[in-house]
Interface confidence: medium
């Protein structure tokens, strides 16, 4: 999947653009909005009817090296009595994000953008039908 | 920076950390080959905390289109299909990394940007605070 070029209908390429070798792009990995934080104080992952846990995956050859993945705690959903309702299902909600992968080929290093799918949390859904026959 | 394990036979001049600026291949590798997007495509309708999806478009960003979830109700849908206001529909938010064209309008020069997106909604029991 290639990054689309800027369409001429929108912009004229400025003269100030840095020179870039063919087939590659320049990427500054100093993150804009680096200090933005999601408020985790409301602990919705424990209060949800489809609760989840978080696990941190660590990869030193990836930037960012830490990616947090959610895992649904149950198959069913938690009802008002705190019991698992097995007619409903806890399902993962997923979102794509970008990471930079550092690859070692002998002593040389190359960088590759990657799309990764992150499980963000879980929601409670009704299955379409009960049985497929 | 992030420390990277090196081949011991390589020259010491190699930077162990991710450099501030890197040249990357224009092709993006997709790690999500074993997922079935159709499976989750209608969760927004079938959830007990359903949501609508709003298109957010920005040609200076990659991906240029991001879908934002907005919970349809304050409460959650009960077994009878009615909204139960004893429960709350709340958005699940996630920080994701996108590419921002920098300098603006440049075709092959980007900077990573962290943005907060609402991905979907989940039904939670409210924490009851009584104001005396």
């Amino acid at each position: 999947r290639k990054i689309p070029k800027v369409g001429h209908t929108f912009f004229q390429k400025p003269e100030s653009c840095p020179p870039v070798p063919g087939g590659s792009m320049k990427l500054d990995i100093g993150i804009i909005n680096e200090n933005q934080r999601v408020s985790m104080s409301r602990n919705i992952e424990s209060r949800s009817t489809s609760p989840w846990n978080y696990t941190v995956t660590w990869d030193p050859n990836r930037y960012p090296s830490e990616v947090v993945q959610a895992q649904c705690r149950n198959l069913g959903c938690i009802n008002a009595q705190g019991k698992e309702d097995i007619s409903m299902n806890s399902v993962p909600i997923q979102q794509e994000t970008l990471v930079v992968r550092r690859k070692h080929q002998g002593c040389s290093v190359s960088f590759q953008l990657e799309k990764v799918l992150v499980t963000v949390g879980c929601t409670c859904v009704t299955p379409v039908i009960h049985h497929v026959q | 920076g992030i420390t990277i394990p090196r081949n011991p036979g390589c020259p010491n001049s190699e930077d162990k950390n991710f450099p501030r600026t890197v040249m990357v291949n224009l092709n993006i590798h997709n790690r999500n080959t074993n997922t079935n997007p159709k499976r989750s495509s209608d969760y927004y309708n079938r959830s007990t905390s359903p949501w609508n999806l709003h298109r957010n478009e920005d040609p200076e960003r990659y991906p240029s289109v991001i879908w934002e979830a907005k919970c349809r109700h304050l409460g959650c849908i009960n077994a009878d299909g009615n909204v139960d206001y004893h429960m709350n529909s709340v958005p699940i938010q996630q920080e994701i990394l996108v590419l921002r064209r920098e300098p603006p309008h440049c075709p092959n020069s980007f900077r990573l940007e962290k943005i907060l997106v609402s991905v979907g909604c989940t039904c939670v029991t409210p924490i009851v605070h009584h104001v005396a």
């Epitope: 895992q71 198959l75 097995i86 007619s87 499980t119 379409v128 | 079935n36 499976r39």
Partner: antibody
Framework: QVQLVQSGAEVKKPGASVKVSCKAS????????MHWVKQSHGQRLEWMGG????????SYNQNFKGKATLTVDTSASTAYMELSSLRSEDTAVYYC????????????????WGQGTTVTVSS | DIQMTQSPSSLSASVGDRVTITCSAS?????MHWYQQKPGKVPKLLIY???KLASGVPSRFSGSGSGTDFTLTISSLQPEDVATYYC?????????FGQGTKLEIK
């Protein structure tokens, strides 16, 4: 076609642990839940629990919490059920059984079964 | 947990007979499934959602009932129907099965 192939019979001493495997083929392993059912000396079936390889979600029958641990290795399309602190009453045939996908069918709809693994606990 | 009680625990009938097995739940359930387990074999889904015939199951098998009382009927018993039959509720966690009804041919 869908196949669930379980590991062979086990004889264990009281207090030991045993791990039974269930290798799935003929479908996308990640998309369906896997359940485990105990059958003691040809009698009543007891549902032990189920696991969703995709979300990591697990549901246990309270009677088996602390006794059984369900895990999966998605890269090997294999589900595992480990029994700890074995006692004579754990002697039984243990079945893995495929559940629904949570999308078309409910997670708890069991359709295909493994051939069963006999676990004998004897001193 | 919802307790499932089957009756009879065992029965013997002749080929061609109409056979009825009942299952009583300790509290009301929405769905009942029935499994057939032939000697030395794995359980096989026979009836799902109380009355729907699973794929490949002969039409002589039928299911009915609601609330706490459910029935599995074989309209004309065949030699290959020798098996143990289990009811299973799919309403409340955990899934629970009846103790089984062993069916033999006279």
């Amino acid at each position: 076609q869908v196949q669930l192939v379980q590991s062979g019979a086990e004889v264990k001493k009281p207090g030991a642990s045993v791990k039974v495997s269930c290798k799935a083929s003929g479908y996308t392993f990640n998309e369906y839940t896997m359940h485990w059912v105990k059958q003691s000396h040809g009698q009543r079936l007891e549902w032990m629990g189920g696991i969703n390889p995709n979300s990591g979600g697990v549901s246990y029958n309270q009677n088996f919490k602390g006794k059984a641990t369900l895990t999966v290795d998605t890269s090997a399309s294999t589900a595992y059920m480990e029994l700890s602190s074995l006692r004579s009453e754990d002697t039984a045939v243990y079945y893995c059984a495929r559940g629904g996908d949570g999308y078309y069918t409910n997670y708890f709809d069991i359709d295909y079964w493994g051939q069963g693994t006999t676990v004998t606990v004897s001193s | 947990d919802i307790q499932m009680t089957q009756s009879p625990s065992s029965l013997s009938a002749s080929v061609g007979d109409r056979v009825t097995i009942t299952c009583s739940a300790s509290s009301s359930v929405n769905y009942m499934h029935w499994y057939q387990q032939k000697p030395g074999k794995v359980p096989k889904l026979l009836i799902y959602d109380t009355s729907k015939l699973a794929s490949g199951v002969p039409s002589r098998f039928s299911g009915s009932g609601s609330g706490t009382d459910f029935t599995l009927t074989i309209s004309s018993l065949q030699p290959e129907d020798v098996a143990t039959y289990y009811c299973q509720q799919w309403n409340s966690h955990p899934l629970t099965f009846g103790q089984g009804t062993k069916l033999e041919i006279k």
